[in-house]
């Protein structure tokens, strides 16, 4: 089978030195030296398919996969990673070998998987599969911390089951929204695992290792404020704990509060109170609801009551699995070069997602944001409107959640023009895509306004570089144009830009370009 | 029994305030939510926010939002509701209505007798 | 916002006749998994405040006639008066409690014919 081409798989381990860190290249960073992946045909494969060694990877390690093949000719080549095309771009080393790389910057666990490499060469087509998995570094795990009530003392006592054990601490704060962000002068922290102050407004419980960092928060309805005007969701999944504070502050001790499911009081050992007086001589009553650990028939209505304040509820659902719900369907957005523009994707999710945004191979870190109605939203404004493809990627324990993103910038046609001897093409990347002329400039014409119709051909968006469309026209050379300057404009409804191309002429093409407005 | 008791009409000129009183006997003032509600002639009926008389918090309707201020005095189980900047689109009859909470926060079981605010120059 | 529409905007029947109100909402106010609807409707007559009839789609308020039903659920819902008699002539409105802010159908004015 000599047709096929010699092809070479490596793995290169990055030295985490920050200075890579962002960089997405088709060139090895400072490396150790490079593994040799094997690359075995797949027997019984549909197609041709080689197949490398797993890759296994510390967490925020830095590799590159790399493939180096010995074919004659040009090669062109296609990424995929869950079922997301990745722009390739192949280069050709010093013994005119075609490398193709995929670099992985700080790996995590979303960068884990299959990539799949299409290459098309001139003479065969073939799949190359690389399997990366995250090394089983003494099955670390960090897992979301949860409540319990520390025997007979009113305390709740924060668990994370992790590896390696995890450093666990109470995040406190005492006023509303927006100062109980993390590094607020209101933000208290207690690196403990049992807490008795239990009175506080916001009371939440994290817990770190070398994976990073998880934090649950203990889901608080306080009969003093307005309830938000979408009840309150808390999703769970079967078999984990539950755990509902209701506050009520008033001006002596003569209330009482109750917790009732769907109009029937809680049995008893599902619930504890606590109360205290405050600084301005008020008492303050907490009323716990639990069940340490949930099935089905516990979902429904949760309803804190008083005798002197309002009723609240929050709807708590049993889920078997977690998920993420959001509309998968992909996006284009249409923006002016200076615009002010953020995609947005709105999710509702349990248990809470990870999740990155890609463009071109670079990953940029994902924020959320909590919004009042049980959705959450993750933004990212970041693009520098670079027109393409955008990718945003979540999962969570249970699910994983893909949605595209395309972004258009309206601005005026840049052309670039090649030629050879017997064709002139120019290429443009403006949008909205543009349209094409050729003129040819002569004695007749100086002003090259002689339109040339014949032998001209173009093509809309022949070439995707990250989701971003090149439109292209060539001319075919024909006699009656050998030896003439020609024009060609590439128009939209911002604009004009052209290239003169001197056709026939020996040694480089004399590109002369001008912009018309 | 259950009575929500709104102050009398009030005449009033564009760019004035208005504040409109609601007293409460019957049952525990500090139990219920209390939401304002308006009706401009012949018209349908519009939410303008909800108050928690027990803590004194508010939440408003994004549209009155900066205009209106809804508060309460426990010690005689009154709301108010002051509307500034008035226009003559804000002529309306005004309600009080009482909510029940819990899971069924939103919806009203008494009203007030309502208070009809003119706005006209 | 949740916009409620009804139809008719009246209608006229014969006393003892049964008279149907449709309400429809913009979204879905039905809240998994409890599949509960939040959605009241509203009695007004002239010159009063309106009077609670109906809540959660199909909870009669009490002290409210048993010829006043409510049913429906997810975005559509309807009112509907089993045998009119002459005290029911009101303006009706539905109003959504699901999300902020809450807001009222324009209303249907119910005649006898």
């Known amino acids: 089978n000599q047709d096929l081409p010699v092809i070479k798989c490596v793995l290169i381990n990055h030295k985490n030195n920050d200075s890579s860190v962002g960089k997405s290249s088709s060139y090895p960073m400072v490396s150790e030296s490079p593994e040799d992946l094997g690359c075995a045909l797949r027997p019984q494969s549909s197609g041709t398919v080689y197949e490398a060694a797993a890759v296994e990877v510390d967490v925020s390690a830095s590799i590159t996969l790399q493939v180096l093949v010995d074919a004659p000719g040009n090669i062109s080549c296609l990424w995929v990673f869950k079922h997301s095309s990745l722009n390739c771009q192949p280069h050709f080393d010093l013994q005119n070998r075609g490398v193709v790389s995929m670099v992985i910057l700080k790996m995590t666990e979303t960068q884990a998987g299959e990539y799949l490499l299409f290459i098309q060469s001139e003479a065969t087509n073939y799949t190359i599969l690389f399997t990366v998995s995250i090394r089983n570094t003494l099955l670390y795990t960090l897992r979301r911390p949860y409540f319990r009530k520390m025997e007979n003392q009113d305390a709740l006592v924060c668990i994370s089951e992790s590896v390696p054990e995890p450093i666990v601490e109470w995040v406190l704060c005492d006023s509303q929204g927006e100062s109980c962000k993390e590094e607020s002068p209101a933000v208290v922290k207690k690196e403990e695992k049992v807490l008795h102050e239990l009175f506080g407004t916001d009371i939440r419980c994290c817990a770190r290792n070398e994976l990073g960092r998880e934090c649950t928060r203990l889901f608080t309805i306080d009969l003093n404020q307005t309830p938000q005007t979408t009840l309150p969701q808390l999703f769970l999944k079967v078999g984990e704990p539950l755990w509902i504070r209701c506050k009520a502050v008033h001006v002596n001790h003569g209330f009482g509060l109750t917790w009732e499911l769907e109009n029937k009081a809680l049995e008893e050992g599902n619930y504890f109170e606590m109360s205290t007086y405050s600084t301005n001589r008020t008492m303050i009553r907490i009323l716990f609801a639990f069940v340490s650990s949930v099935a089905r028939n516990d979902t429904g209505y949760y309803t804190c009551s008083s005798s002197k304040h309002p009723s609240q509820s929050a709807l708590v659902t049993i889920v078997e699995k977690g998920f993420i719900n959001a509309t998968n369907s992909s996006e284009d957005y249409e923006i002016d070069q200076y615009e002010e523009f953020c995609f947005s994707v709105r999710f509702k999710a349990y248990p809470q997602i990870r999740c990155t945004w890609t463009f071109s191979r670079k990953s940029f870190p994902c924020e959320q944001k909590g919004l009042d109605n049980g959705y959450s939203i993750s933004k990212f404004c970041n693009h520098k409107h670079q027109p393409g493809e955008y990718i945003f990627h979540a999962e969570n324990d249970d699910a994983q959640f893909t949605k595209m993103f395309t972004l258009n910038i309206r601005r005026k046609p840049q052309v670039l023009a090649e030629a050879s001897a017997s064709q002139a093409s120019c290429f443009s990347d403006g949008y909205p895509l543009p349209s094409w002329t050729w003129k040819k400039c002569s004695d007749k014409s100086p002003n090259c306004t002689e339109e040339i119709t014949e032998g001209v051909w173009n093509r809309k968006a022949n070439r995707k570089v990250f989701g971003q469309w090149v439109s292209s026209s060539t001319l075919n050379m024909s006699e009656a144009i050998k030896g003439f300057l020609v024009k060609c404009c590439a128009y939209n409804s911002l604009g004009t830009s052209c290239e003169t191309i001197l056709l026939n002429s020996p040694g480089p093409f004399p590109f002369i370009q001008d912009n018309i407005s | 029994q259950v009575q929500l008791v709104q102050s009398g009409a009030e005449v009033k000129k564009p760019g004035a305030s208005v504040k409109v009183s609601c007293k409460a006997s019957?049952?525990?003032?500090?139990?219920?939510?209390m939401h304002w509600v308006r009706q401009a002639p012949g018209q349908g009926l519009e939410w303008m926010g909800i108050?928690?008389?027990?803590?004194?918090?508010?939440s408003y309707a994004q549209k009155f939002q900066g205009r209106v201020t809804m508060t309460r005095d426990t010690s005689t189980s009154t709301v108010y509701m002051e509307l500034s900047s008035l226009r003559s689109e804000d002529t309306a009859v005004y309600y009080c209505?009482?909510?029940?909470?819990?899971?069924?926060?939103?919806?009203?079981?008494?009203w007030g007798q309502g208070t009809l605010v003119t706005v006209s120059s | 916002d949740i916009v409620m529409t009804q139809s008719p905007d009246s209608l006229a029947v014969s006393l003892g006749e049964r008279a149907t109100i449709n309400c429809k909402s913009s979204?879905?106010?039905?809240?998994?998994?409890?599949?509960?609807?939040?959605l009241a409707w509203y009695q007004q007559k002239p010159g009063q405040p309106p009077k609670l009839l109906i809540y959660?789609?199909?909870t009669r308020e009490s002290g409210v006639p048993d010829r006043f039903s409510g049913s429906g659920s997810g975005t559509d819902f309807t009112l509907t008066i089993s045998s009119l008699q002459a005290e029911d002539v009101a303006v009706y409105y539905c109003?959504?409690?699901?999300?902020?802010?809450?807001?009222f159908g324009p209303g249907t004015k119910v005649d006898i014919k």
């Open positions: 209505a009482r909510d029940l909470g819990g899971a069924a926060a939103g919806y009203f079981d008494y």
């Open positions: 019957g049952y525990t003032f500090t139990r219920y939510y």
């Open positions: 108050i928690n008389p027990s803590g004194g918090s508010a």
């Open positions: 979204q879905s106010i039905s809240h998994s998994p409890n599949t509960r609807d939040y």
């Open positions: 959660w789609a199909s």
């Open positions: 109003q959504q409690y699901y999300s902020s802010p809450f807001t």
